[in-house]
Amino acid sequence: MRRERGRQGDSSSCERQVDRVNLKPCEQHIMQRIMGEQEQYDSYDIRSTRSSDQQQRCCDELNEMENTQRCMCEALQQIMENQCDRLQDRQMVQQFKRELMNLPQQCNFRAPQRCDLDVSGGRC
């Protein structure tokens, strides 16, 4: 578990940090997980990079932010928002959400409390 910097993280500061980090490795990692390593997902060139490598890159990016529940929630919501239109059906949305929820634990970060991942205004 990384050390905690600040009790919750100020909202505007979290937004700035999430804007600054590259969340694509996290999006690719989750897409690879739910596609079962199939080559169906060609929005990114993900075949050249193994899922475990993407996970490490994702964790490295998230490590650039404050380890607060507030900032982690903001990052997860942004990932969901970014990928929403690529998720083809309800089942895929649920799979993506499940993998997304596991991401903090995979990176050995604090899971955010009370984090609403249904942020896409009904699109997802």
């Epitope: 993280g9 507030r70 929820m101 984090c115 249904d118």
Partner: antibody, heavy 123, light 110 residues
């Protein structure tokens, strides 16, 4: 049937203390967050404090932090609120509520409420 | 002054539909789940909606909840005289580490 019964309210002078109790029945108390919520006469609802299932995490309204202490006894299915250094603005009906918060990806919601106990702080 | 803003009062005739808004910020409604409560005169509040859109058992489907960005809405269709009450929204605020309630909306059924 879920029941929450508060007790311990009454008239107290400014600077005084009171201990509110809430007896819970009809559900597995140890598996739920519990919450105190208050309502001043003719006013809206105000959250006071939360306590996690095992008592390991507590959150407080800023204006009561350091004066109020929330605690629980899972063996007795009871919730408590120790109120010290009471002020006139603490005058309210205090409700014991069951909080449905379960995990990282759910929210606080109060699905069962007691009848409330009135705390009056006045000289 | 509540951080979550609701209209103080609203009125409509029986059978009509009303919506009650609750507006907040990114640190509360924007990132967390919203719940709604009904308080009839001289009684404890009752949960109507939780996790933005879900209804507890026993709450009729005339009541609905939605959320978009930093605002939430409670909808009530087929208004009945028994719906005359105060309605409150609530959510967690991650910056304050506290649950916030809206100031409440008094619904009058004409």
């Amino acid at each position: 049937e879920v029941q929450l019964v508060e007790s311990g309210g009454g008239l107290v002078q400014p600077g005084g203390s009171l201990r509110l109790s809430c007896a819970a029945s009809g559900f597995k108390f140890s598996t739920f967050y519990m919450t105190w919520i208050r309502q001043a006469p003719g006013k809206g609802l105000e959250w006071v404090a939360n306590i996690k299932q095992d008592g390991s995490e507590k959150d407080y309204l800023d204006s009561v932090r350091g004066r109020f202490t929330i605690s629980r006894d899972n063996a007795k299915s009871s919730l408590y609120l120790q109120m010290n250094s009471l002020r006139a603005e603490d005058t309210a009906v205090y409700y014991c509520t069951r909080n449905g918060l379960q995990d990282s990806y759910s929210g606080d919601f109060f699905d069962h409420w007691g009848q409330g106990t009135l705390v009056t702080v006045s000289s | 002054q509540s951080v979550l803003t609701q209209p103080p009062s609203i009125s409509a005739a029986p059978g009509q539909k009303v919506t009650i808004s609750c507006s907040g910020t990114g640190s509360n409604i924007g990132h967390n789940y919203v719940s709604w409560y009904q308080q009839l005169p001289r009684t404890a509040p009752r949960l109507l909606i939780f996790d933005n859109t879900k209804r507890p058992s026993g709450i009729p489907d005339r009541f609905s909840g939605s959320k978009s960005g930093s605002s939430a809405t409670l909808g009530i269709t087929g208004l009945q005289t028994g719906d005359e009450a105060h309605y409150f929204c609530a959510t967690w605020d991650a910056d304050l580490s506290a649950v916030l309630f809206g100031g409440g909306t008094k619904l009058t059924v004409l």
